[in-house]
Interface confidence: low
């Protein structure tokens, strides 16, 4: 009598979740009388996938009709495939009996699901940081599978290499998570820098998933201060510009101390940006040369994104014996840019 | 309709021996992963024993070497063969239906008691 | 063994409200978590399988979530008929093994 075979003619078959899969099956003989059942994993803890001979399976139909008496073919249809559903299936031949003897087992087919990666999250710093400073980017996606998957970042479209990928768990698993940590040197060019982590994997057919952060969340460029004296107006007015430039973000608070004595306090707002994404403050301040009898010292203190102050000072000169009311008494610039006694930057 | 039915259960001293039985109707008992599962008097529930649709058996650890399951295909019932019986054994016994899918259970027996006292 | 700790061990709610209990399993179970309803008395009925697949006839006030450790099942709208004591289960590897039970009962 001719040995009786249980043939599963694909070693592997591979399914897109959401999708059916047809696990094929068939014996060689219909002799001698018994079920096929079909199951996912071996030994004694595998789990029944389909019973051909009676039971409810709401996702597993058979490919024919196993009633009829002269069929040879035991293949089924798994719809709606999930991640969990991966495993080794395994068509098994029983003898009639009481209880049912296992006569042979195919050799099984491994269903390997292709679960899409999750649109990749960028995240960046929690607080800003200045030009010349690293910053780290995390970049995560979820739940794909197979494990094989590429991970890139890129800054303002050139590749990044201070990189580190993780891809978990490390061992077998139905679907699996990448993250990803970037280094990334901040210039003062940056406030219109993007970051992108690209997400290639089989399932997406060469259209990888792409995640952005803008480099404009992550980044405080400080400003420059410059102090200068206009020439001497008629009325004895000395103007005086504070020019605060090239700072980002715009949130920003500048005031004018003379002596010492607060003079007044302005916010900047609704600044024009520059090409580069910062932001350019002019404030002005009139002295009144005839009401001070002693040099006056000005001070432009200007506090940006909570930071500590940076103060830039002026002296504007008040001659010694000033002539009459409405003459022509000159305000000397010293010419020297005092620095803030706690470190502000010139 | 589907149904179990449990019998057997009674009054049994220490070291006594007890036989349970399953009647199951509506469906082929042997088609199905069968498990019996007790419950002692104000606990909760604990898994006993299991016999698969090839006949393969299992048992919880505080059963093993004095429980036999086994099942008579002609009858469609299921057994539980009881011997060196403790008080702790002492309990409501179900007769449990494995679920063809993935053998969660579906289909409960109404139960028999056991009690092991001298 | 796989341990199935369940919370809480009693809960008092009213008719019409909202009720949540968890399961953690000591090892992943992927989603085998079954949940079962039990009348003083009566034997067990089961409600959900695979964690939140309903058996044939529960209404759809049951629903179950959760894979991996962590499961729990809810229930949207009680009435006087749910109070009752639930168990949780799992049955991803022998033994199978039930949660201690949450008894619910009418505040």
């Known amino acids: 009598e001719e040995e009786l075979q249980v043939i599963q003619p694909e070693k592997s078959v591979s399914v897109a979740a959401g999708d059916s899969a047809t696990l094929n099956c068939t014996v060689s003989s219909l002799i001698p009388v018994g079920p096929i059942q079909w199951f996912r994993g071996a030994g004694p803890g595998r789990e029944l996938i389909y019973n051909l001979k009676e039971g409810h399976f709401p996702r597993v139909t058979a490919v024919s009709d196993p009633t009829k008496r002269n069929n040879m073919d035991f293949s089924i249809r798994i719809s709606n495939i999930t991640p969990a559903d991966a495993g080794t299936y395994y068509c098994v031949k029983f003898r009639k009996g009481s209880p049912d003897v296992e006569l042979k087992s195919g050799a099984g087919t491994e269903l390997s699901v292709r679960a899409k990666p999750s649109a990749p999250v960028v995240s960046g710093p929690a607080v800003r940081a200045t030009a010349e400073h690293t910053v780290s980017f995390t970049c995560e996606s979820h739940g794909f599978s197979p494990r094989d998957i590429t991970l890139k970042w890129f800054k303002n479209g050139n590749e990044l290499s201070d990189v580190q990928t993780n891809v978990d768990p490390a061992g077998k698993s139905v679907s699996y998570s990448i993250r990803s940590t970037a280094r990334v040197l901040l210039t003062r060019r940056d406030v219109h820098s993007q970051v992108i982590c690209e997400v290639a994997h089989v399932t997406l057919q060469g259209d990888p998933l792409r995640g952005t952060a803008n480099l404009s969340e992550a980044i405080r460029v400080p400003p420059f201060l410059e102090v200068t004296q206009q020439s001497m107006r008629a009325d004895n007015q000395v103007n005086v510009t504070c020019q605060v430039t090239k700072f980002y973000p715009q949130r920003l608070q500048l005031t004018w101390l003379e002596n010492g004595n607060v003079s007044r306090t302005e916010m900047a707002s609704a600044l024009p940006e520059n090409k580069d994404g910062t932001y350019n403050w002019t404030s002005w301040l009139l002295v009144n040369v005839s009401a001070h009898r002693d040099d006056v010292k000005l001070t432009c203190q200007v506090e940006h994104d909570g930071q500590p102050a940076v103060n830039k000072s002026f002296s504007v000169k008040v001659s010694a014996h000033p002539k009459e009311q409405g003459s022509n008494t000159a305000a000397e610039n010293t010419g020297t840019n005092e620095r803030n006694i706690y470190g502000g930057s010139g | 309709e589907v149904q179990l039915v449990e019998s057997g259960g009674g009054l049994v001293q220490p070291g006594g021996s007890l036989r349970l039985s399953c009647a199951a109707s509506g469906f082929t008992l042997s088609s199905y992963d069968m498990h019996w599962v007790r419950q002692a008097p104000g606990k909760g529930l604990e898994w006993v024993s299991a016999?698969?649709?090839?006949?393969?058996?299992y048992y919880t650890g505080s059963v093993k070497g004095r429980f036999t399951i086994s099942r008579e295909n002609a009858k469609n019932s299921l057994y539980l063969q009881m011997n060196s019986l403790r008080a702790a054994d002492t309990a409501v016994y179900y007769c449990v239906r494995g679920g063809v899918w993935d053998d969660a259970f579906d289909i409960w027996g109404q139960g028999t008691m056991v009690t092991v006292s001298s | 063994d796989i341990q199935m700790t369940q919370s809480p061990s009693s809960l008092s709610a009213s008719v019409g409200d909202r009720v949540t209990i968890t399961c953690r399993a000591s090892?992943?179970?992927?989603?085998?978590a079954a949940w079962f309803q039990q009348k003083p008395g009566k034997a067990p009925k089961s409600l959900i399988y695979t964690a939140s697949s309903l058996h044939s006839g529960v209404p759809s006030k049951f629903s179950g979530s959760g894979s991996g450790t962590d499961f729990t099942l809810t229930i949207s709208s009680l009435q006087p008929e749910d109070f009752a004591t639930y168990y949780c289960?799992?049955?991803?590897?022998?033994?199978?093994?039930f949660g201690q039970g949450t008894k619910l009962e009418i505040k």
């Open positions: 016999i698969g649709t090839a006949g393969d058996t």
């Open positions: 090892q992943g179970i992927n989603n085998y």
């Open positions: 289960q799992q049955y991803v590897s022998y033994p199978y093994t």
